[in-house]
Structures are given as C-alpha cells and as structure tokens.
C-alpha cells in the first residue's frame, strides 16, 4: 500500500509569548513545529515515529496564521507519506518549539525550547475530507486539520490496491475508486484485454482483435461470419457446414454442375415441341406435325405428307399445296377417278375391284407397293421415324434407324450416358459433366481417362483426416477428400460444431 497523511496547520496562538517551562521568549517565540506520526497507542509513549515524522521551518512569532504553501520550505499541508496498508488508526504528536537560531533549519539549532505539545489518538479512514480540530492549553491554542489520502495509482479503504490506467494490448481500462478495473468502451474480460466484437458476430465462427470487428475463421464468410463457404468449385449448390456442396433442385454431381433438368433450364425444343429430360444434360424433343430435326427446328414441306393420290403431283403454295391430277382423276387430292377396271388402272400386279356399280374402282396392291393405283414403291422412311437426328435406311420390306453417337433404340429415342461406354481405365469412377465424361481415378492413376500411371500418388501421404476417402485427378491439387459425416474442410480436418476456444487459425 501507499498513501500520505496530510496535516494542515491553520493558526497558532501564544499571546503572551511563553514557553512550556513558564519562561517568556525574547523578543518573541520564533515558532516551528515537530510532528511525529505513529501506530495507535492508548497511552502515547516516546519512541520511533513508526509512520513518519517531519519538521517545519520557523512559521511565525508568538501568534500567527499559517498559509497554505505547495512547495519549497514551509510547505503546508505537511506530508507524511507511508508505504504500507493504512491501518485506520494512528497516534499524532504535534510539538511547537521556539528557536533562537536559523529560520529555515531550526531543528539543527542548539538552545531550542518547547512551547507546547498536543497528542491525538484515534481512528481515521482514508478519504478526501479534512478532519478539523483545535487544541487549547493554558497558554496556547492550535487550529489544524488532517486527512489520509492514497498515493497516485493506489486505491481502496487502506490504499492497498495498486491500479494504473492503461490502454495497450495488455489492458484497456481506467481505475475505479476501489481500485477495480473499469473497461474502456469496446473491451471486456478480467483485464479488459478482450475486444467486444461486432454485434451479432458468430461466437464460434468469428473473432476480433479490436472492438466492432468480425474476422471469419476458415470455412465461414459474411459480415457476421454466419455463412458457410461451399466446396471450392460448387456451381449450383449450397452448404450448411463449410466445404459442403448440397445441390440445388435440378442439379447433381460432386460439384452440382450436372444439369438434371436441361429442359427447364435451357428450353432447347423449338416450335411448340415437347421436351423430355433423360439424365444429366440429356433430353429428347417430340415434334409437332410439320416439323423435324433434333430440336424440331426444321419446318417440313406442305407436300411432305404426300397428300396427292393416284399419282397426282404436289406443288407447295404459300400456306398450303395444290395437286395436279393425272388423266382420269380429279378432286383436291386427285381422289376421284373417271376410270373403271376396264381401263386396267392397277399397276405392279395390283388387282382391280369395281365399286359403285362399276362407276369406280379400288386397287389391292401386292407387298411393297402402295398408292391408289399401286403406283408407289413403299418407303418406310417417309414418316421420319428416327429421333435425335438418326438416319433412316430402307432394308427391303423393313427399315432401320442409324443413330447418332450418344443415342440408341429402334427409333434412336434413348440417350446413352457418356459413362455407359466405360471410358475410365483402371477402375476409375465416371461422372457425366457438361463437357463430357470426367474420371475420378483410384490411387496411383491420373489423366482424363485414368490412363496415366503416376509414380507420386498425391493420396499416398494420407492428406485426408478423420477417415476421409482420398481421390486423385479431380482437382488442381491432384487430390480431393470426401469427408465422413461430422467433418469439414479441404482435408476434412475440422470437426463440425467446435468449442469456442478451438484454434482455427493455421
């Protein structure tokens, strides 16, 4: 502890100029004071001034008022500093002396004589308020006041608590009257060394080094560090924990980059045709009559359906067609005949049958021939039966569809996955991606098709933690860790839901 006992001398009265022994001072009592402060004694005794002692220069002659003086010789109030815990009790002896000698250092002069003395014993609490008193004896009167205050940076009832205000990285505080710390705005903790982060900053996922700041730990982002960072390369997905990639509706694959709903996202089918999804990036367009092509983008000729019968020739017009009928036929589609079986109208061995009492006829055609007069060889490709750009080929009485790469089925209506051809060598796992198949290679292989045997296996060093599976050939780092439930991070090194003190910073 550390404090100061302060004694303010106010007035001394010795009207007759007398000494304690009854003699008078000549020409007057040149008065100085000796003060002795010690521990409390029920009966004051001589002995060391255990709490300190002090002497004044000559302050006046006989009777005088003592003015306050802050420095130099004759300082008033008198200061009695102590370096211990103030006990709350004391004994004080104030002696008035006459000196015939030096004004400034009367203590050293021979022939000094006691004028009077007073003894005060009692309790005194630390505080700024002065206690005022007056002591009289037969010859003299002394008015004075006193108090105990703590030295700078000492606080409390006994001046025992040391506290120094500071504003550095070991504390940001001021001192309360009892010596306890009062944190500066924005700081908290026992020593006021912990900043108060931005309001709402996530307790586990964010931290700060100065007030109103929110710095995110790895895997988190946003103003309050409450948004997780999805897996690097995650295209159409979100996360609920860091490094996750949970696909949005209609997307699939490790990075949610495989379109499972191409029809909705891209509307590839034209001219009112119907679109059907068929796997990642796969779709089929079903055309309305009068349209063809993979996306039904090609309009058919109005004559394409061969509307003219009985050998009539079809001519396209702006919004319709016109049939030019051969001799013996008439009508919009040359459907009416002026011929009879007598005119032998059936070609290619067709049999003629009379109708309407011989006023018209019908031909029954042999195999591979058609038309009102069996005049046409059957073409099984005219109905465009091959989907997805397949080529139709007549094969005698039947026809076949020759499909484009990636399609199969009688009418090329089925989409083949790029992975169906098993393009990945050495047991690699195939993923259908937008730009073709991508292979996830087993340990020891790399390359687009896992065809390259690698001498340095990026997974060999066991970079994945917590039982995660390591894959090579998927990323620029040559490996990707597939985390088990409950772990996150590029190496699955972070457990989900860490305690606040977890050391995230690497």
């Amino acid at each position: 502890g550390s404090g100061i006992f302060q004694l303010r001398l106010q007035e001394f009265v010795n009207q007759r100029g007398m000494l304690a022994n009854g003699q008078s001072c000549e020409p007057g009592c040149r008065t100085f004071f000796r003060i002795c402060l010690k521990h409390f004694q029920a009966t004051f005794s001589e002995g060391p001034c255990t709490f300190g002692n002090v002497s004044t220069p000559v302050l006046g002659t006989n009777s005088f008022v003592v003015r306050d003086k802050n420095s130099g010789s004759g300082r008033n109030p008198l200061q009695l500093p102590f370096n211990f815990t103030w006990p709350g009790t004391f004994s004080l002896n104030i002696q008035a002396w006459h000196t015939p000698g030096d004004d400034l250092r009367p203590e050293t002069s021979p022939g000094n004589s006691l004028i009077s003395q007073i003894i005060i014993q009692g309790s005194l609490a630390v505080g700024k308020i002065w206690r005022t008193d007056e002591q009289n004896d037969t010859l003299t009167r002394l008015s004075y006041s006193y108090r105990v205050i703590c030295s700078d940076n000492y606080y409390g009832e006994s001046c025992s608590r040391l506290c120094k205000k500071r504003d550095d990285h070991f504390g940001h505080y001021e001192c309360q009257p009892d010596g306890s710390l009062s944190c500066l705005p924005g700081w908290t903790g026992k020593y006021c060394d912990q900043p108060i982060c931005l309001s709402g900053c996530h307790e586990q996922n964010g931290y700060c080094s100065k007030p109103d700041e929110c710095i995110c730990r790895p895997g988190w982002q946003g103003r309050l560090c409450n948004e997780c960072i999805p897996h690097n390369g995650c295209r159409h997905g979100t996360c609920s924990i860091p490094w996750q990639c949970a696909c949005d509706e209609g997307w699939g694959g490790l990075f949610c980059d495989q379109d499972l709903n191409y029809c909705t996202h891209h509307s590839p089918c034209k001219n009112g045709s119907t679109c059907s999804n068929s796997g990642p990036k796969g779709y089929t367009c079903t055309c309305l009559p009068g349209y063809t092509g993979e996306h039904c983008e090609l309009g058919l000729s109005k004559c394409a359906s061969n509307p003219c019968r009985n050998g009539g020739s079809c001519k396209d017009q702006e919004n319709s067609y016109h049939c030019l009928c051969p001799p013996g036929y008439y009508g919009q589609h040359c459907e009416h005949s002026t011929l009879t079986c007598a005119d032998s109208p059936c070609f290619n061995g067709g049999s003629c049958r009379e109708r309407n009492q011989g006023s018209s006829y019908a031909c029954e055609c042999p195999p591979n021939f058609t038309g009102s007069n069996c005049e046409k060889k059957v073409d099984r490709c005219t109905s465009n039966p091959c989907a997805n750009g397949g080529q139709c080929q007549n094969r005698g009485p039947s026809r076949t569809c020759r499909c484009r790469p990636g399609f199969t089925g009688t009418h090329c209506e089925l989409h083949i996955s790029d992975c169906a051809r098993s393009p990945c060598a050495h047991g690699g796992t195939c993923h259908d991606l937008e730009n073709g198949p991508v292979c996830t290679c087993p340990a020891g292989f790399s390359g687009r098709r896992c065809e390259v045997r690698i001498t340095h296996d990026a997974c060999a060093s066991g970079p994945c933690f917590n039982g995660a599976t390591c894959y090579t050939g998927l990323s620029p780092n040559n490996f990707v860790c597939n985390c088990p439930y409950g772990f996150v991070g590029s190496r699955c090194e972070f457990p989900v839901g860490l305690p606040p003190s977890f050391p995230w910073v690497a």
């Epitope: 700078d152 940076n153 040391l162 120094k164 205000k165 500071r166 504003d167 550095d168 990285h169 070991f170 504390g171 903790g189 026992k190 020593y191 060394d193 912990q194 931290y207 080094s209 710095i215 003190s501 050391p503 910073v505």
Partner: antibody, heavy 121, light 106 residues
C-alpha cells in the same frame, strides 16, 4: 511447465531474410491469457524488444524495426515465427522467444534459451 | 520514442543493500518489471507490476515505482545476485527495456 525453444539458421548473409521459429511445449499457444514475443540481445549489449503476437494473429512491432519484421503464428503446430528482412551485421544477436502474461501486466515469465544468429557473408 | 535510463553499474558489499534505479518520463504511471540476467543465461523475471514478486524469487528482492523513477532493491545482497538487471515497461503497445545495470558484489 511451459517451455519455449527457438530454432533456425545460425548464419544469415547480409540483405537476406532471417527466419526463426519458436516451439511451445507444455501449454497451448491458443490461450487467451498470453502473448508470444521476440527479444534480441546483440553481443555485450542490452535487451531489445522486437514484437509480439496473439493466437488470433494480432501483431505488435517495435517501431524501429516495423518495416522489416513479420511475426506469425501456427496454432496447429503450437509455434510462432519471426522473419526479419534485409539484415545487416547490426542484426547479429542472440534472439529469444518469450511468453507475455496478461495477468502479470504484460511481464514475461517464460523465455527460451536463446539462439545466436550471425549476419555475415 | 520512450526511453528508460539505468546506471551502468552498481557495486555492493555482501549483506548490504543494493538499489538500482530506472528513470523514464512519468514512469510511475506505468507498470515496471525487472529482469535478472546472468552471463550466458536467459533473463529471469524478478519483479512485475512495480513491486510484486513471482513465485520462487527471494524476499530480498523488492520494487517501488513513483514519479519518474522505478527502483529495484536487493537487501542483504548475496554473491549469487551478481548479474545484469534490466527494467522494462510498456509505452502503449511498444515494449521498452532499460539499458541494463551490472551489479557487482564486492
């Protein structure tokens, strides 16, 4: 009982970068009660504070060295490091790592044994 | 920049009291620490926060700090106390050491 151990090359060429690492054992570098610092002492001379760091990465540097000093922390390895660039012969010293305790008003109650780094070509 | 000034050397007879001063502008408003360093060894904290002793430091080491001066006092000095002594304080966020005082036990 916490222990600190400095490591790094004992000889560095002028104009190059001095790099030292302090490994902490027997306690966590991630404790909120401590800062971790570097102090140096040229041969036959007094101590000079270089800087210190908190486990979150907050750093404090001696203004006279600030332009050349970088202190970093690796909580996963329980280590912190010092880099001093563009060294000259005046940077020859014994380099100490130390722990500063907030509860001791920022006094350093644990020191490494020190490592002598000589700057010479 | 903030400076702490110490006398280069102090001599003391065994059993006597050695006082080492450390001066700096308004040093009494900062906390002073004292470190003892013997030849070839790392410094050891002997006083922190002006006058507090860490565990294991003998009672003969004491400290005070007021005004512009901090003082380390070694009462009943022993030959084993012969060492260099450094005062240290923080000026805002910067650590400052005194120049050091060599204590010789005669």
């Amino acid at each position: 009982e916490v222990q600190l151990q400095e490591s790094g090359p004992g000889l560095v060429k002028p104009s190059e970068t001095l790099s030292l690492t302090c490994t902490v054992s027997g306690g966590s570098i991630s404790s909120s009660s401590y800062y971790w610092g570097w102090i140096r002492q040229p041969p036959g001379k007094g101590l000079e504070w270089i800087g210190d760091i908190y486990y979150t990465g907050s750093t404090y540097y001696n203004p006279s060295l600030k332009s050349r000093v970088t202190i970093s922390v690796d909580t996963s390895k329980n280590q912190f490091s010092l880099k001093l660039s563009s060294v000259t012969a005046a940077d020859t010293a014994v380099y100490y790592c130390a722990r500063y305790d907030v509860s001791l008003g920022g006094s350093s109650d644990h020191w490494g044994q020190g490592t002598l780094v000589t700057v010479s070509s | 920049s903030y400076e702490l000034t110490q006398p280069p050397s102090v001599s003391v007879s065994p059993g006597q009291t050695a006082s080492i001063t450390c001066s700096g502008q308004r040093l009494g408003d900062k906390y002073a620490s004292w470190y003892q360093q013997k030849p070839g060894q790392s410094p050891v904290l002997v006083i922190y926060e002006d006058s507090k002793r860490p565990s294991g430091i003998p009672e003969r080491f004491s400290g005070s700090n007021s005004g512009d001066t901090a003082t380390l006092t070694i009462s009943g000095t022993q030959p084993m106390d012969e060492a260099d002594y450094y005062c240290q304080a923080w000026d805002r966020d910067t650590g400052v050491f005194g120049y050091g005082t060599k204590v010789t036990v005669l």
